[in-house]
């Protein structure tokens, strides 16, 4: 006999990287008929929802109106049907951004390179942090972690046209508190026509919504804006 129900999906809207003082909603999707959902934060009960009527609802939302460092951390949810509880969801890492300072992102030898050239990004932040994150905008997110006292190097190696796109970096004060994003750096890689057609540039988002490509989600949930990429989430673990 089944002792637990399948785990729910958990994700953040609009995304798991939340600028300080902005709002975010944590969503938990279980099953129709669930009489109770519980949201846990860093291992402690955070909130409870008892849907009405339960047979018409399979998803609940937990609202955070004012993101800050106290709200950043790991969230999970569970649900109950009758007396039977589900497995806990995967962990959702909620990150607060726009903390303290803004790093500077530069690229060597420059933003316009030829396919096959070696390219290195440099992220610099003078305040006390030793971890840096380089993010490439687009539907398939590319995240690298780097370390250094005030600057981290991100060698991309010999680039292809697949490396084309817009990059930003963050300083990370801890796993869940990141700096302001750097100004964007657009990398233009020129190559032959055949390579270009094989490796089109990732679709990018307008500058004011650049973070939405890094939604924290899980496969199986049909949502247009849900981009099933765990790269950044896994980096936090």
């Amino acid at each position: 006999q089944q002792q637990t129900l399948p785990k729910p999906f958990i994700w953040a809207e609009p995304h798991f990287m939340v600028p300080k003082e902005k709002q975010v909603t944590i969503c938990c999707q279980g099953n129709y008929g669930a009489v109770e959902y519980q949201l846990h934060f860093e291992g402690s009960l955070f909130a409870v929802d008892r849907p009405k009527p339960p047979e018409r609802i399979n998803k609940v939302q937990f609202y955070i109106p004012d993101m800050n460092s106290r709200m950043a951390g790991q969230y999970s949810c569970i649900y109950r049907v009758g007396e039977l509880w589900s497995e806990p969801s995967n962990l959702l890492d909620l990150v607060v951004t726009e903390m303290y300072d803004t790093p500077t992102l530069s690229v060597h030898p420059g933003p316009e390179v030829i396919s096959g050239e070696k390219v290195t990004f440099y992220c610099r932040l003078d305040t006390a942090t030793s971890m840096f994150l380089l993010l490439k905008e687009g539907r398939s997110s590319h995240v690298q972690r780097g370390y250094g006292k005030v600057q981290a190097e991100f060698p991309l190696g010999p680039v292809t046209t697949a490396h084309r796109g817009t990059y930003r970096c963050f300083g990370s004060y801890n796993n869940h508190a990141w700096s302001f994003p750097s100004e964007p750096v657009k990398l233009l890689v020129t190559g032959d026509i055949e390579n270009t057609s094989l490796a089109p540039e990732d679709p990018t988002f307008p500058a004011d919504t650049w973070g939405t490509y890094l939604l924290t989600t899980e496969t199986g949930l049909q949502k247009d804006h849900a981009l099933w990429d765990h790269t950044a989430q896994n980096l936090l673990r």
Epitope: A47, V48, D49, Y63, I64
Partner: nanobody, 127 residues
Framework: QVQLVESGGGLVQAGGSLRLSCAAS????????MGWFRQAPGKERDFVAA????????YYADSVKGRFTISRVNAKNTVYLQMNSVNPGDTAVYYC????????????????????WGQGTQVTVSS
């Protein structure tokens, strides 16, 4: 912006009853989930009870379940904590808190989930 003012605290004998009130000023009281927390000297602030913006559901700490009742009257912008069968372990400063929720069936248990706090009212239970 919501301002919260607690009242009703005082000295009560073990086994007795007390009703705490929390009056909210500001708009949209009915949109806020409300909670009561307590803090004994030298200890952390502990969850006591919470109520959703609609008044149902409610949620209680195990230590007060069956003894305390939380309720609200949105027309009066007030939330109440009825405390029965009190014991010396209930001695603490009691705080009222308010937090916005996405749904009217959500109760908030963790203090981080509340944006607004009252100044507190002292409850002392003598044996």
């Amino acid at each position: 912006q919501v301002q919260l003012v607690e009242s009703g605290g005082g000295l009560v004998q073990a086994g007795g009853s007390l009703r705490l009130s929390c009056a909210a000023s500001g708009r949209s009281f009915s949109r806020y989930a409300m909670g009561w927390f307590r803090q004994a000297p030298g200890k952390e602030r502990d969850f006591v009870a919470a109520i959703s913006s609609s008044g149902d559901p409610t949620y209680y700490a195990d230590s007060v379940k069956g003894r305390f009742t939380i309720s609200r009257v949105n027309a009066k912008n007030t939330v109440y904590l009825q405390m029965n069968s009190v014991n010396p372990g209930d001695t603490a400063v009691y705080y009222c808190a308010a937090g916005l929720t996405a749904r009217d069936t959500t109760v908030v248990v963790h203090p981080n989930g509340y944006s607004y706090w009252g100044q507190g009212t002292q409850v002392t239970v003598s044996s």
